[in-house]
């Protein structure tokens, strides 16, 4: 079952409560507005370095510049995760590491940065112009991803400077994150406030049909507003990616083109406090992906007003493997 963010339908205030309600309506937008303005925007940086000793060996370093706690890091190559990118490693701050050839060694450098060394030989070694992406899932900011690659003229042993260039992803809560939700709330409440000022309070009509007020679904943007913001991904070089087969034989080089193993996007897990709380049975995690809370098992339908979702052409399980197929 999916639990959606819901707002009660607007009901006229009771006559006796009008003063208190009016006062509350005045205070709330300003509180929210303050929060909106002060909410910081996190960033992800990516640094790609070619080792001087092994010319086809790469070191990728990624970091998260934000105040939230990181719940998962996914490193991929060939483009953003879930957009044709192939997972190289998944790092969880408490649960450990899963990685895939040609990754040689993934590790945490600090609480908010990781490094990944890639093997330099064999059919699965990266091309010099490969794009590497790092996706940080954090609470409460959501998911943020940035990509980087070696500059064309890189000398061995030199590294590309860190690139804090996050790619906008509609399945990432970080697009608006908390501040986006608050901003929407601010605008909405200011709109209510204006209407409330210009209209006398009508009499309360008791509902004859239902004891509970009808509920309006939050975050259901129109097609027009969905189309309002569409940021394309960075160009992805796929020249060194073989095709997949039903029979996955790694003879003649490991089958590294695996995309994420299955079960992470389509069953998102709650990034909150994994370290300290006992983990509930599978399927009961709470997701903060997309900025809305939803019971794990189904994705929330929309990210927010005015945002275009980037559905994965491979279907709901395309993001799978962050943890190596389930």
């Amino acid at each position: 079952m999916r639990t959606e963010a819901q707002v009660p339908a607007l009901q006229p205030p009771e006559p006796g409560l009008e003063g208190a309600m009016g006062h509350r309506t005045l205070v709330l937008p300003w509180v929210l507005l303050t929060l909106c303005v002060t909410a910081g925007t996190p960033e992800v940086w990516v640094q790609v370095r070619m080792e001087a000793t092994e010319l086809s060996s790469f070191t990728i370093r990624c970091g998260f510049l934000g105040s939230g706690s990181i719940s998962l890091v996914t490193v991929s190559w060939g483009g953003p995760n879930g957009a044709g990118g192939t997972t190289l490693a998944v790092l969880h701050p408490e649960r450990g590491i899963r990685q895939w050839a040609p990754a040689r060694q993934a590790r945490w450098e600090t609480q908010s940065s990781i490094s990944l060394i890639l093997e330099g030989s064999g059919a699965s070694s990266p091309c010099a112009n490969t794009t590497f992406c790092c996706k940080f899932a954090s609470f409460p900011e959501g998911s943020w991803e940035a990509c980087g690659s070696l500059p064309p003229s890189s000398d061995p042993g030199l590294s590309a400077p860190p690139t804090p260039a996050p790619i906008l992803r509609a399945d990432l809560a970080g697009i608006l994150g908390v501040s986006g939700v608050l901003l929407f709330g601010c605008v909405y409440l200011l709109h209510l406030l204006r209407r409330h000022k210009h209209r006398p309070a009508p009499r309360l009509q008791p509902s004859r049909t239902s004891p509970q007020a009808p509920r309006a679904r939050a975050w259901a943007p129109s097609q027009a507003s969905q189309a309002a913001l569409h940021v394309p991904y960075a160009t992805i070089n796929t020249s060194c990616r073989p095709a997949t087969l039903d029979t996955a034989h790694p003879h003649g080089g490991p089958s590294w083109w695996a995309s994420l193993p299955t079960h992470a996007a389509h069953r998102p897990q709650g990034p909150a406090a994994w370290a300290s709380t006992p983990i509930p049975a599978r399927g009961s995690f709470v997701s903060v992906e997309n900025g809305l809370y939803a019971q794990a098992g189904e994705r929330p339908p929309h990210t927010g007003p005015g945002l275009t979702l980037f559905p994965d052409p491979r279907g709901p399980r395309a993001m799978e493997g962050p943890l190596g197929v389930r």
Epitope: L245, S255, W257, G321
Partner: antibody
């Protein structure tokens, strides 16, 4: 019921190769990684490597790299491990195990395949 | 490689007793430790994952605790069917490594 049914015992000569199979049933094969574990007699367990049945992505313990090769056939929901250049040190029980990436552990173990290498 | 040390190779206990099996990691592995039980002639099976979470169907007599480098599996009210080898596993970093095992004997 979720099961990982492995192929039967093998008696082999030094220098030969063996292909151990692991047939999955009771779940969607491509939804879970398959890892392989070695248990030598009187010894503990050793992790060999992992394969993602969705796409064939692999990762090996350096100790077994070059000797073990992991493959999958999605159509028959079967994982395979080939061991080459066998020596008496390779005599052991080999297990395929299912990795649950929601909770990060080996939730289902195969029936085990005993491999004996003897001249 | 991370070394997982189970210092007690053998432990002897009686039915109804409480027993603690320990596992020490050579470096900080956070909560990335699981416990597996292997009865004679059988494949191992999952008991505890991520240090303290019981696998489906495991009785609450089995409790896991610890984080960092020291981990404990406690079996309270030991039953005769608990006669088995118990292994810890770390998946904090590659290669994943198992402890040497503790054989629990019931007297």
């Amino acid at each position: 019921e979720v099961q990982l049914q492995q192929s039967g015992p093998e008696l082999l000569k030094p220098g030969s190769s063996v292909n151990i199979s692991c047939k999955a049933s009771g779940y969607t094969f491509t939804d879970y990684n398959i890892d392989w574990v070695k248990q030598s007699r009187g010894k503990s367990l050793e992790w060999i490597g992992a394969i993602n049945p969705n796409n064939g992505g692999t990762f090996y313990n350096q100790k077994f790299k070059g000797q073990a090769t992991l493959t999958v056939y999605k159509s028959s929901s079967t994982a395979y491990m080939e061991l080459r250049s066998l020596t008496s040190e390779d005599s052991a029980v080999y297990y395929c195990v299912r990795w649950d990436s929601d909770s990060w552990y080996f939730d289902v173990w195969g029936t085990g395949t005993a491999v004996t290498v003897s001249s | 490689d991370i070394v997982m040390t189970q210092s007690q190779k053998f432990m002897s206990t009686s039915v109804g007793e409480r027993v603690s099996i320990t596992c020490k990691a050579s470096e900080n592995v956070r909560a990335a430790v699981d416990w597996y039980q292997q009865k004679p002639g059988q494949s191992p099976k999952a008991l505890i994952y991520l240090a303290s979470n019981r696998h489906t169907g495991i009785p609450d007599r089995f409790t896991g605790s610890g984080s960092g480098t020291d981990f404990t599996l406690i079996i309270s009210n030991v039953q005769s069917e608990d006669l088995a080898d118990y292994f810890c596993l770390q998946h904090w970093n590659y290669p994943y490594t198992f402890g040497g095992g503790t054989k629990l004997e019931i007297t």
